[in-house]
């Protein structure tokens, strides 16, 4: 009776098992009860990650810099290229196969995480006593200034699109308030 | 240090049942494939089961197809024989032994061996 | 099934003497052929894998042999310490066998 299953560096073929071929390299001929499976190398800018039985090798995925990828990791004979996006911009997906600008925060909201190569950034609303008036992928939102360390006091209140306006004391509520 | 330790060997009456297990120590065992191997009284040699690492696959001797199930618990480290309907021809002493290949990337296509073996458990069927 | 016939059965020898133990394969195997040392109450060593591989440790006065149907393992000058059964052992396909056993006696 013939086999019907292999140990796992091996695979089934005409009754018999034979040795897979190691990763980097692509499968010539099946093994017989005398000769060993023949592999060959993968060519330049080709790769196989696994223990196979391919009889050909992948293409390295190319960084198209017109979708705004460039190369992270250059490809191996064992193992794919691997993209990421020019500064500015993050992937679509987890294969990074396009990417997009960043997006920026809004007036009233300030950056809670910058972006990377593979996120976008993360905004969040100016909590009350912050305040952001500007559209940015940077820009956190910024504490109202205090005016009371200024030795002033609040002209205009702050929003949390705009800065507390801060003013002189009246003088004459402070020359009573030194008498 | 890389240890396999079989249990569960004992007396059974023919007809009866046995669960040998096989502890494993000192190494990944959920990246290994592994084997059970017996040896009656004063003979040779017998390969019994093989399984591998994930459990997916499983194969046997033609003497105990449909009688012995080979299994395994990777979150526990323990490799398990279920013998039923044992036969006097069951009498042996069980081992466990761990599959290798051994690869060299230099090399051709690499190669396997058993090269952890435990130091078995003696399995006794008779009335 | 892959049988496997090792011959002597058994053979007795001196201390310094060169031995050689032949496996012969019932179809071709290639080189996936092990050979194990075992003493008695003990379990079995794994001495040679591919048909020809050292296994780490062991003395390089073992060494084995050959491809497709025909093996030998050979050990060049005879220790004390190597006095005991040899077995040979295909892995190219299930179910794995073994051979019969080669015991190895002092003369």
């Known amino acids: 009776e013939p086999p019907t299953a292999c140990r796992e560096k091996q695979y089934l073929i005409n009754s018999q098992c034979c040795s897979l071929c190691q990763p980097g390299q692509k499968l010539v001929s099946d093994c017989t009860e005398f000769t060993e499976t023949e592999c060959l190398p993968c060519g330049e800018s080709e790769f196989l990650d696994t223990w196979n039985r391919e009889t050909h090798c992948h293409q390295h995925k190319y960084c198209d810099p017109n979708l705004g990828l460039r190369v992270q990791q250059k490809g191996t004979s064992e193992t794919d290229t691997i993209c990421t996006c020019e500064e500015g911009w993050h992937c679509t997906s987890e294969a990074c196969e396009s990417c997009v600008l960043h997006r920026s925060c809004s007036p009233g909201f300030g950056v809670k995480q910058i972006a990377t190569g593979v996120s976008d950034t993360i905004c969040e609303p100016c909590p009350v006593g912050f305040f952001s008036n500007v559209s940015s992928a940077f820009e956190k939102c910024h504490p109202w200034t205090s005016c009371e360390t200024k030795d002033l006091v609040v002209q205009q209140a702050g929003t949390n699109k705009t800065d507390v306006v801060c003013g002189p004391q009246d003088r004459l509520r402070h020359h009573h308030h030194h008498h | 240090e890389v240890q396999l330790l079989e249990s569960g060997g004992g007396l059974v009456r023919p007809g009866g049942s046995l669960r040998l297990s096989c502890a494993a120590s000192g190494f990944t065992f959920g990246s290994y494939e592994m084997n059970w191997v017996r040896q009656a009284p004063g003979k040779g040699l017998e390969w019994v089961s093989y399984?591998?690492?994930?459990?997916?696959?499983?194969d046997y001797a033609d003497s105990v197809k449909g009688r012995f199930t080979v299994s395994r618990d990777n979150s526990k480290n323990l490799l398990y024989l279920q013998m039923n309907s044992l036969r006097a021809e069951d009498t042996a002493v069980y081992y466990c032994?761990?599959?290798?290949?051994?690869?060299?990337?230099?090399?051709?296509?690499?190669?396997?061996?058993?090269?952890?073996w435990g130091q078995g458990t003696m399995v006794t069927v008779s009335s | 099934d892959i049988q496997l016939t090792q011959s002597p059965s058994s053979l007795t020898a001196s201390v310094g003497d060169r031995v050689t133990i032949t496996c012969r394969s019932s179809q071709g195997i290639r080189s996936s052929l092990a050979w194990y040392q075992q003493k008695p109450g003990k379990p079995p060593k794994l001495l040679i894998y591919g048909a020809s591989s050292l296994e780490g440790g062991v003395p390089s006065r073992f060494s084995g042999s050959g491809s497709g149907t025909d093996f030998t393992l050979t050990i060049s000058s005879l220790q004390p310490e190597d006095f005991a059964t040899y077995y040979c052992?295909?892995?190219?396909?299930?179910?794995?066998?073994f051979g019969q056993g080669t015991k190895l006696e002092i003369k």
């Open positions: 399984i591998s690492s994930s459990g997916e696959t499983t």
């Open positions: 052992q295909q892995l190219a396909s299930f179910p794995s066998t």
């Open positions: 032994a761990r599959d290798v290949f051994f690869f060299d990337s230099s090399g051709d296509n690499g190669a396997y061996g058993m090269d952890v």
